[in-house]
Every structure is written in C-alpha cells, then in structure tokens.
Amino acid sequence: NFMYSKTVKRLSKLQEYQQYYPSLTCVMEGKDMEDWSCCPTPWTSFQSSCYFISTVMQSWTKSQNNCSVMGADLVVINTKEEQDFITQNLKINSAYFLGLSDPKGWRHWQWVDQTPYNKNVTFWHSGEPNSPDERCAIINFRSEEWGWNDVHCHVPQKSICKMKKIYI
C-alpha cells in the first residue's frame, strides 16, 4: 500500500514536469534506493545538478534568458571537480558563457544565482580578468588547460546552463 501510494505520487509528479520537459532521465538514489533524481534528457548530471551545453551563439543576456526559459541559469562553478566534469563535454576550439559577470566594470564579479564570489575558488587563465570593459566570463581552452576569461558581453558565444536535479 505504501509502495503503491509512493508510485502514484511519482507518476503525478512526472506528469507535472512533463509539460516543461518532454523527457526525463532518472536514477535511483538514497540509502534504500527509494528516491529518484532526474535531469531533462539530454542534460548531463553531476552531484545534485543537471547541465546543458547550448551550442547556439548568443550574447550573455540572451544566453541567460535562454537558460531561464528552460528553468535553469547560466552555470555557476563551485569546485574544480565540477569544472572538470563540465569540461569533459566541451569543444576545445569553442568558448562558453558562464553565469559570472561584472555589470559595472568595477571588477565586482557576481554569480547569477547570488552565490558569493570567492576569489579562492576561481579558475581564471593567467593574466585574466584583464579589462574593465569585458564584463562577462567565458570558459575556454588555452595553454593546455580549461580556464576563465573576461569578454565583451554582447559578442555571441555558446553557453552552459545549470539547474538543480528534479527529485521525485
């Protein structure tokens, strides 16, 4: 009876999400394997988040708008492990917007989800950020490693979206 009511709840939750995400990929989690954590197909999952690499070229504002249409934000990178996971799926000759910007050019960097900007957990390329006119951050591959660079926000780039996993 308990299992039946849990399944019914799950199905109604799935139907609820169906209107936003036509397809979800779910895995069983938790100590009793009773919880399901899901990401929209074809998003990838890492820890408690889902990631989507957008290959359409857009300005930073439009990229953030595009992520929000999908219920996400431009990616906020919190750890080196997270960055290493994300970069496995990136093309080395491309650049991708992050959810990091310096709106006034005062070198006050801020994440789109209001996560505090911690200078000790940043992955800027050597010599970056280097211009107060370049107020948006990208991740790209240079000098044999992935790192961040400040760029002009209005020049179109690819982007990475991130959202919390859906638990059902």
Epitope: V56, T61, A95, V155
Partner: antibody, heavy 120, light 107 residues
Framework: DVQLQESGPGLVKPSQSLSLTCSVT?????????WNWVRQFPGNQLECMGY???????NYNPSLKNRISITRDTSKNQFFLKLNSVTTEDTATYYC?????????????WGQGTLVTVSA | DIQMTQSPASLSASVGETVTITCRAS??????LAWYQQKQGKSPQLLVY???TLVDGVPSRFSGSGSGTEYSLKINSLQPEDFGIYFC?????????FGGGTKLEIR
C-alpha cells in the same frame, strides 16, 4: 563616429574568388563588437554571411561554411571577405556591418555597400 | 535557422495614412527583433530594436510591438520620407535572419 567602407572589384568571373575589404574608421576593430559581412541579393533579400569578433574568432553562416573566410589586418583596422567558387547566384550588394550594438539587438552601423556582379 | 516571414511584400499608401507591416518568426525570438528602413541606393537604417525600442532620432510616428513569434511595425500619419523598403531581422540566435522586405510606395 564609427564609419565602415567596403572596397573591391565590381565584377568577378564564375568559379573565381570574390575578395572585399572593409576599412573601419573612428573605432578600433580590436576594442569590442563583432564585424559582419551582410549581402543583399537583387530581389532585396538580405543575408548575414558571417563575422570576425574583436578578439579574432570567426562564425560563418552554415549555408556558406565551405566557401567563406573572414580575416583582418589589425594594423590597418580592416577586415576582409573571401568567397570561393562564386556563381551568378553570388551577385549581390555586399555590406560590412558592426554587430553588438544595443546589447546585440540591432545592426546600427553599415557601410554604404558595394555591388559585385558575377558574370563571364 | 529561424525563418522570418514578412507581409505584405508591397504596400501602397497615401501621405497621412497609417500602415502596419508584420513579421512572423518560425520560433519564439523573445522580443529580439529589429526593424530597418532602406531607401533606394542606400544601406538599411536601424529604426527599432528589441521589438519596440526606437533608436534615438527616429520619429515617434513609428512604433514596434509584438511578442513570441508575431511582431509588427506601425507607421502613423505617413510622411513623404517614410517611403522605401522595410525589413525585420531577428536577433535571438546566430545566424540572424531577415524578412523578405516590404516595399512601401506612394499611392
């Protein structure tokens, strides 16, 4: 104020390459923005061909990808269009245009255009 | 690519009249739409960006509206200098494509 000026041959033979130059005054092409080539066919239809960004990266319209190259000479503040294997279908007025104004919401600065006819 | 369908292809009107030109996108372009005016032998001139914001110096008789996939440019009280070709262009994802143009002629 920023000004853009196209130059190049007005007549190109089929199967040859079309080469145009855009000279920019009043703004450095390495400072910001992205620098486009847009063409207008005889029936007035406009097409974005591709661009080079202030930091030198390119993006091309997939319909032209194998034939187009956009490069620049930063010392002369110029950028260039090369279109290979042209046919009569490439007859058009070619414009160089600055991209990225109004947070990338519209093309505010255009050259005056140069007519290129492809004919034997 | 997002396709832009503009209508009508041509339009005859008299000075003082009001006209409306429409543009339909093949997908949601989230208000990232620009309108241009082009006079004979000249390059296009930006009139409106973000669907409804007029560029400085553009007369207030021009107005843009719309959302999603449907947009329009309205010109109130047509003036002799308003005649020419009008184009829409989306600015949502690269490549930014143009409508086919609307030729506005004096009746």
């Amino acid at each position: 104020d920023v000004q853009l000026q196209e130059s190049g041959p007005g007549l190109v033979k089929p199967s040859q390459s079309l080469s145009l130059t855009c000279s920019v005054t009043g703004y450095s092409i390495t400072s910001a923005y992205y620098w486009n080539w847009v063409r207008q066919f005889p029936g007035n239809q406009l097409e974005c061909m591709g661009y080079i960004t202030y930091d030198g990266s390119n993006n091309y319209n997939p319909s032209l990808k194998n034939r187009i190259s956009i490069t620049r000479d930063t010392s002369k503040n110029q950028f260039f269009l090369k279109l290979n294997s042209v046919t009569t279908e490439d007859t058009a007025t070619y414009y160089c245009v600055r991209g990225g104004d109004y947070d990338d919401g519209g093309f505010a600065y255009w050259g005056q255009g140069t007519l290129v006819t492809v004919s034997a | 690519d997002i396709q832009m369908t503009q209508s009508p292809a041509s339009l005859s009107a008299s000075v003082g009249e009001t006209v409306t030109i429409t543009c339909r996108a093949s997908g949601n372009i989230h208000n990232y739409l620009a309108w241009y005016q082009q006079k004979q032998g000249k390059s296009p001139q930006l009139l409106v960006y973000n669907a409804k914001t007029l560029v400085d110096g553009v007369p207030s008789r021009f107005s843009g509206s719309g959302s999603g996939t449907e947009y329009s440019l309205k010109i109130n009280s047509l003036q002799p200098e308003d005649f020419g070709i009008y184009f829409c262009q989306h600015f949502w994802i690269i490549p930014y494509t143009f409508g086919g143009g609307t030729k506005l002629e004096i009746r």
